[in-house]
């Protein structure tokens, strides 16, 4: 979790002098409770936006927006703490809006936005806006939270972001898999424009079961420049196991930008359809 570096962070608006500060996520009002505290944020919205850095890189960011309730507690509102928690790692990053002037009611509802938290593809976040000072231990909560899942790199808009392109999102291998005679699979895919090796991971399963009955790994050496964007054809030999008929083929590239953590592509071959009619019984029975 980090903040986008592309410009100075501002929260001032007409009628309010405000500055954005780094926060430890542990505001002073936890330790020194105040008697009078503001009410909670209203209409918290989290949206996925895209922003460029000064270097021209494109990153997905969480656009956080909320409004104030129209009650007298804005007289005691000193700022807001914005917290983003990445759910699978428990990593948290906070910033604090510090109001340098008193808020006054005006003809339209106060609205605040912040679009500088960089988020990762396929990650879920809990976004919380706490009004400051925080409430006394038994006071009504004055925060609002929402969970937000970022699309993965297969999403058309995410595909062109820097983190997705770094993990190989622009490569479309267009995998085809066909079953050959004599327990073989023919795998064909399009190479990318980089001289890097690939790995084909074959996992076979019985019909309607999810524990594997055969696994095989096949190494493909780095192609020469004249082979870039060409089709690579590989024939894999299967284990002759009856019923081990559903095959998942996964292609793992090792691009320089993502090494052994690149996006993998896969294709699946289903088991052949079982005939609905029962096997015919022969007219005669052999005697031996």
């Amino acid at each position: 979790l980090r903040l986008l570096d592309h410009r100075a962070l501002v929260c001032s608006q007409p009628g309010l002098n405000c500055t954005v500060k780094n926060s430890t996520c542990l505001d002073d009002s936890w330790i020194h409770p105040r008697n009078l505290t503001p009410s909670s944020p209203k209409d918290l919205q989290i949206q996925l936006h895209f922003a460029h850095t000064q270097q021209g890189d494109l990153f997905p960011v969480a656009h956080i927006e909320w409004t104030l309730q129209t009650d007298a507690s804005i007289l005691y509102l000193e700022g807001a703490e914005l917290s983003v928690l990445q759910l699978n790692t428990n990593e948290r990053l906070c910033v604090r809006f510090e109001f340098l002037s008193k808020l006054r009611h005006h003809h339209r509802r106060w609205r605040f936005t912040f679009s500088h938290f960089v988020v990762d593809p396929d990650q879920e976040y809990e976004v919380t806006v706490h009004h400051l000072p925080k409430p006394i231990p038994d006071g009504d909560p004055n925060h609002q939270s929402k969970n937000f899942l970022v699309p993965d790199c297969e999403h058309a808009r995410m595909k062109v972001t820097t983190p997705c392109m770094s993990s190989g999102s622009l490569w479309d291998p267009n995998i085809t898999v066909e079953t050959l005679e004599a327990h073989q699979l023919r795998v064909s895919f399009t190479l990318w424009n980089e001289s890097t090796h690939y790995q084909i991971l074959l996992t076979s399963f019985p019909h309607m079961e999810n524990h594997s009955c055969f696994e095989h790994m096949h190494h493909i050496p780095a192609p020469r420049p004249e082979e870039f964007h060409q089709r690579s054809n590989v024939t894999l030999t299967l284990r002759n196991l009856k019923g081990c008929c559903r095959h998942q083929v996964q292609i793992q590239p090792f691009f320089s930008s993502c090494l052994n953590d690149c996006l993998r592509h896969s294709a699946t071959v289903s088991c052949p359809e079982m005939p609905d009619t029962p096997e015919p019984i022969p007219d005669y029975m052999p005697l031996w």
């Epitope: 699309p151 808009r157 995410m158």
Partner: nanobody
Framework: EVQLVESGGGLVQPGRSLRLSCAAS????????MHWVRQAPGKGLEWVSG????????DYADSVKGRFTISRDNAKNSLYLQMNSLRVEDTALYYC????????????????????WGQGTMVTVSS
């Protein structure tokens, strides 16, 4: 014109099943997460279920978990809600709704932010 049109509601006995559909038009359906929200007679809105843009993630309210299944067909610009083991308390007007951004607002705290709603389809569960 951006719109969502629900169908499939009706009168059904407790324990039976029903499948709701929602046809989307006027926006790139496969970019956005979608949700089902319901409103029982005389009650407020209750989020029922949500599904991410590529069906990779689905969520359900505790009251329908294990009985309802949300799905989508991006090729047909359609959202579905398969409702099994229906109960009298499932009686409500069911709306499909669109997430306002490309992300997925997960869980029940999201109904206030959805930007496009259908007109609703009525489900009545009664013996």
């Amino acid at each position: 014109e951006v719109q969502l049109v629900e169908s499939g509601g009706g009168l059904v006995q407790p324990g039976r099943s029903l499948r709701l559909s929602c046809a989307a038009s006027g926006f790139p359906f496969d970019d956005y997460a979608m949700h089902w929200v319901r409103q029982a007679p005389g009650k407020g809105l209750e989020w029922v279920s949500g599904i991410s843009w590529n069906s990779g993630r689905t969520d359900y309210a505790d009251s329908v978990k294990g009985r309802f299944t949300i799905s989508r067909d991006n090729a047909k610009n359609s959202l579905y809600l398969q409702m099994n083991s229906l109960r009298v308390e499932d009686t409500a007007l069911y709306y499909c709704a669109k997430d306002p951004s490309l992300g997925y607002c997960s869980g029940g705290s999201c109904s206030d932010v959805f930007d496009i709603w259908g007109q609703g389809t009525m489900v009545t569960v009664s013996s």
